[in-house]
Structure formats: structure tokens, C-alpha cells
Amino acid sequence: EPPTACREKQYLINSQCCSLCQPGQKLVSDCTEFTETECLPCSESEFLDTWNRETRCHQHKYCDPNLGLRVQQKGTSETDTICTCEEGLHCMSESCESCVPHRSCLPGFGVKQIATGVSDTICEPCPVGFFSNVSSAFEKCRPWTSCETKDLVVQQAGTNKTDVVCGPQDRQR
């Protein structure tokens, strides 16, 4: 940013440098040769988050429960309200203007990362030796049952969707 005729936290108006209003305040009147910049605090439902010369404060974001939103952090005169999603939902976009249900991982897939208020469930295919037979937003792939440790033998091979079926060993006659 090239140097300008006014310092940081100042702005140029009518051939003079006026002080910007601090965060949380809006501009009422510019300075003159004889008076300082006049600023006023934002009202309770408004904010300004930078040094500014705005004549209007911004409205706090409304976390609309009809869109699945709730307040994560209440706004102040210097910060906007932060919304997050209700349990079981996550933000549709970075701006989090509405929420959608977490997706479930289908049979054959397990949960790699559980969803949060801002990110969806991440699924992964169950590798060989693991399976998932449910549609779930929480369950990871589970390992196939080890028939050997139970002194049993595999009667039916497992898949990514089914566990192995164990059975008794054939007795030798």
C-alpha cells in the first residue's frame, strides 16, 4: 500500500486528515479545521469491526432457528454474531446462512471424521478386513470377527458390508 497524505487511522476529507472512528462506533460528522471527528457507538443490535468512516453500523447476523441455526457467539458492538448449526446439522456454506442434516455413511462405508456444526461427515470405504452393515453418521468400519481366536473357522467370507460367519471346525472321523 503506497503512502498517503494521512496517517493510519485517519482519512482524507476536504483537504485535511480526520480521525477514523474506532471499532464499535459510526461517523456522525467529519472533522473540520476547528472540530474533531464526531463518532457515536453502534446500538445493541449493530456492530462495526474496523476503524471506519461509516455513517451506519451493520446489523448483527440473525441465527434463524427455522434454518437450523443457533447462536454460537453473541455479537458485540465490534463483532458480528457467529451462528452455528443445531445438533445433527452442519453449515451449507462458509457464511453459514443455513444448515443441512449430516450425511450418513452407507453400508460398505465407515465414518472417517464425525461431522461438526461447520463440516459434514467424511466417509471412507471399508478396507479388506473391515465392514459396515449400517447407514450411520457415527459408526466407523469394524474389523471382521477373528474366528481363530474363538477356536472357530470361517464358514462364510466377510465383505465390506458383512462380517465373516464363523462355525465349528469339522471333526476328523
Partner: antibody
């Protein structure tokens, strides 16, 4: 009382440079911006740029970027405008003025004539 | 850039007349409007800043008014020494811009 005194008329060759001075008195030099304005014969006023003598910060009219360079010397309460690569289009009267809620006090103007 | 328009480029009036010179900006300039007087010898003086604030030493027959994009300068009782060209200038947004000027002459 506030006074703004500019350097005298200049006759210069095309392609050369010229430096116009603007000496301020009767007030605290670093407390006010210095503005520069161009006036071609029989024409209106055109803003060139502004300098803050306190620390040398400037703003220029895009049209004069690369043409005009503004500087200031606090010790002598003098602002300067250098005009480079002069052409006949640069022939004009150049004014400096003290800022502070409009161009509050003007110099008498410096006539720059570019001619071979 | 904000364009400043002085529709009347020259104006003829008699001594003692009330004269009004107008100036229009291409957008709202929030009353950051200044008026200057340039005498025939080239000297320039600030008359009015911030639409209506009389600069020190300027006779009270000069006054300014306006808001938004429309402004005017009034000389209530024209005198011989008021023969000059009058320029408006906006100080709201860089680059500062001037009107084309209104040349005031005596009838």
C-alpha cells in the same frame, strides 16, 4: 498572517524537468496539507496532488502520476513540485495552496512555459 | 471521478444586484463543497468552505447553501471588486475536482 509564496516563472525546454517551490509562513507548516493545482491558459482548475509536510505522505491525481513529484522540507517550511519529461501540454500556471477545510490560502501561481 | 458542473460560464449583473451562481456534483458530496474567487490578475482566494462557512476576511455579502449534489453561491449586493471568476470544488472524494468556473461581469 498566513502567506504562501511561490517561485518565479520558468521557461524550459521540452523533455527537461522543472521544480516549483512553495514557501509557507505565518502558521505551523506541518499542521496542514499542501495541495497543488494546474491551470492552463483560459481554462479551469485541475487538481494534481497533495502532500502532508509532517511525514511526506502523498496522494496524486492518476492523471499526474509519473509527471509530478511532490516533496516537502520541514526545516525551511517549503513544499516542492517537480514536473518531468515536459511537453507543451505542461505549459500552465501551477498553484500551491494550504489545506485545512478547502484550499484555504493560495500561492500567487508559477507560470511554466515549455518551448523549444 | 466526481464531475462538477457550473452551467453558467458567464454572468452579467449590475452593481447592487443579488447574484446567484450554481454548481452541481455528479453525486452526493455531503456538503464538502468549497467556493473560490479568481481575480483577473490570477490571484485565488477561498470564499466559502463546507457549503456555507465564510472564510476569514470574506465580506458577509457572500453566502453559500445547498446539500446533496446541488449548491449555490450568492452575492447579495454586488460590488465592483467582486468582478472575478468563481469556481466550486468538491472535497468529498479524491481526486478533488473543480467546476468549470462562472465569470462575473458588470452590465
Amino acid at each position: 498572517q498566513v502567506q504562501v509564496q511561490q517561485s518565479g516563472a520558468e521557461l524550459v525546454r521540452p523533455g527537461t524537468s522543472v521544480k516549483v517551490s512553495c514557501k509557507a509562513s505565518g502558521y505551523a507548516f506541518t499542521n496542514y496539507l499542501i495541495e497543488w493545482v494546474k491551470q492552463r491558459p483560459g481554462q479551469g482548475l485541475e487538481w494534481i496532488g497533495v502532500i502532508n509536510p509532517e511525514f511526506g505522505g502523498t496522494n496524486y491525481n492518476e492523471k499526474f502520476k509519473g509527471k509530478a513529484t511532490l516533496t516537502a522540507d520541514k526545516s525551511s517550511s517549503t513544499a516542492y513540485m517537480q514536473l518531468s519529461s515536459l511537453t507543451s501540454e505542461d505549459s500552465a500556471v501551477y498553484f500551491c495552496a494550504r489545506g485545512g477545510g478547502g484550499f484555504t490560502y493560495w500561492g500567487q501561481g508559477t507560470l511554466v512555459t515549455v518551448s523549444a | 471521478h466526481i464531475q462538477m458542473t457550473q452551467t453558467t460560464s458567464s454572468l452579467s449583473a449590475s452593481l447592487g444586484d443579488r447574484v446567484t451562481i450554481s454548481c452541481r456534483a455528479s453525486q452526493d458530496i455531503s456538503s464538502h463543497l468549497n467556493w473560490y474567487q479568481q481575480k483577473p490578475d490570477g490571484t485565488v482566494k477561498l470564499l466559502i468552505s463546507y457549503t456555507s462557512r465564510l472564510h476569514s476576511g470574506v465580506p458577509s455579502r457572500f453566502s453559500g447553501s445547498g446539500s446533496g449534489a446541488d449548491y449555490s453561491l450568492t452575492i447579495s449586493n454586488l460590488e465592483q471588486e467582486d468582478i472575478a471568476t468563481y469556481f466550486c470544488q468538491q472535497g468529498n472524494t479524491l481526486p478533488w475536482t473543480f467546476g468549470g468556473g462562472t465569470k462575473l461581469e458588470i452590465k
